[in-house]
């Protein structure tokens, strides 16, 4: 899969889980760097991935809510991320400065199912995202919505 960032260091990866969705995220940020990431798979938190330290932000996804797009910012290390969800919400972690890239699936309808990358003592050197179809398909047609949402926090 595609990796963002300069790379280098030890590899990390979330547990491959074919039975649960990502239901929450913890991201630790310190000294202007993203230190570590941790995903909740179903009801259980997976192992923390990355470097030690930092202050931890935790977000919980609603039932049927998925991460569909991620912006990442690098300056030697991962500086920040914005995660967009299928319910028009977004979560900021760290600061979006430096080299900004967007990550999204090549297949319509796929969602975030895993995170991998490389880390060193100070933080995350590269990050990649695994996308796949959700385990539960939508049961109804999305509502016809002819209203327009406010501008996104990140430019197109």
């Amino acid at each position: 899969g595609k990796m963002y960032g300069p790379g280098g260091g030890k590899y990390f990866s979330t547990t491959e889980d074919y039975d649960h969705e990502i239901t929450g995220l913890r991201v630790s940020v310190g000294l202007l760097l993203v230190k570590s990431v941790q995903v909740k798979l179903g009801d259980s938190w997976d192992v923390k991935l990355g470097a030690l330290g930092g202050n931890t932000q935790e977000v919980t996804l609603q039932p049927g809510e998925y991460i569909t797009k991620v912006f990442v910012a690098f300056q030697a290390f991962l500086r920040g991320m914005v995660m967009y969800t299928s319910k028009d919400r977004y979560f900021y972690f760290g600061k979006l400065d430096g080299q900004i890239s967007s990550a999204y699936p090549s297949q319509e309808g796929q969602v975030l199912v895993g995170i991998y990358g490389q880390y060193q003592l100070l933080g995350i050197k590269s990050i990649g995202f695994e996308w796949n179809y959700p385990l539960e398909e939508p049961t109804t047609e999305p509502p016809v919505n002819l209203t327009y949402s406010a501008n996104s926090p990140v430019g197109r």
Epitope: K69, Y104, S106, E108, Y133, E137, S149, R156
Partner: antibody, heavy 119, light 112 residues
Framework: QVQLKESGAELVRPGALVKLSCKAS????????MHWVKQRPEQGLEWIGW????????IYDPKFQGKASLTADTSSNTAYLQLSSLTSEDTAVYYC????????????WGQGTLVTVSA | DIVMTQSPSSLAVSAGEKVTLSCKSS????????????LAWYQQKPGQSPKLLIY???TRESGVPDRFTGSGSGTDFTLTISSVQAEDLAVYYC????????FGGGTKLEIK
């Protein structure tokens, strides 16, 4: 109900470019990816790519990278396909398409636009 | 790239006959996470846009007559029309949605 209305037939010169439109009604294109498919005369279907009109993200089949450019205007609920450096190989019917309530499958199709490249 | 190969390229049958169309993919379309095959069948009648018939290899789209049945898994798939009607004259395409989207070359069904 869901409708995709494509622009009229085009006769264009080799080397020129053409921009086709697909006007959606019955839904907001912001909520769906818009796909484009090529069909050469008496031949099969080829997927060109998709655009996410809300964010402007695009993905192309590698063989159409550099040939096709997808854009969308959410204010007019319209998706566009631009084809550049046209040759006789680009003579085809071009369809826009949209999924139904499930992703991965194209449940709604436009009527198609015939592009003829000829000197 | 996933390559989709359909056979035969054309066939002619009489109304009421059973017909079987084949589609093979160059790699498995079975998603190990969702345990579903990302294969669809489309019907394109002369002068018309394609129409979705079957998805997930075997699920019939609503409104599609039950004489159309999809089967198969992995790399080998089949569309069966149990009793061909005159209105089934069309080209039938399979399409994978496992990695990007690729159509097969199509099978042209003619009625004798």
């Amino acid at each position: 109900q869901v409708q995709l209305k494509e622009s009229g037939a085009e006769l264009v010169r080799p080397g020129a470019l053409v921009k086709l439109s697909c006007k959606a009604s019955g839904f907001n294109i912001k909520d769906y990816y818009m796909h484009w498919v090529k069909q050469r005369p008496e031949q099969g279907l080829e997927w060109i790519g998709w655009i996410d009109p809300e964010h402007g993200n695009t993905i192309y089949d590698p063989k159409f990278q550099g040939k096709a450019s997808l854009t969308a205007d959410t204010s007019s609920n319209t998706a566009y396909l631009q084809l550049s450096s046209l040759t006789s190989e680009d003579t085809a019917v071009y369809y826009c398409a949209r999924r139904g309530w499930l992703p991965a499958w194209f449940a709604y199709w436009g009527q198609g636009t015939l592009v003829t490249v000829s000197a | 790239d996933i390559v989709m190969t359909q056979s035969p390229s054309s066939l002619a049958v009489s109304a009421g006959e059973k017909v079987t169309l084949s589609c093979k993919s160059s790699q498995s379309l079975l998603n190990s996470r969702t345990r579903k095959n990302y294969l669809a069948w489309y019907q394109q009648k002369p002068g018309q846009s394609p129409k979705l018939l079957i998805y997930w290899a075997s699920t019939r789209e609503s409104g599609v007559p039950d004489r159309f049945t999809g089967s198969g898994s992995g790399t080998d798939f089949t569309l069966t029309i149990s009793s061909v009607q005159a209105e089934d004259l069309a080209v039938y395409y399979c399409k994978q949605s496992y990695n990007l989207y690729t159509f097969g070359g199509g099978t042209k069904l003619e009625i004798k």
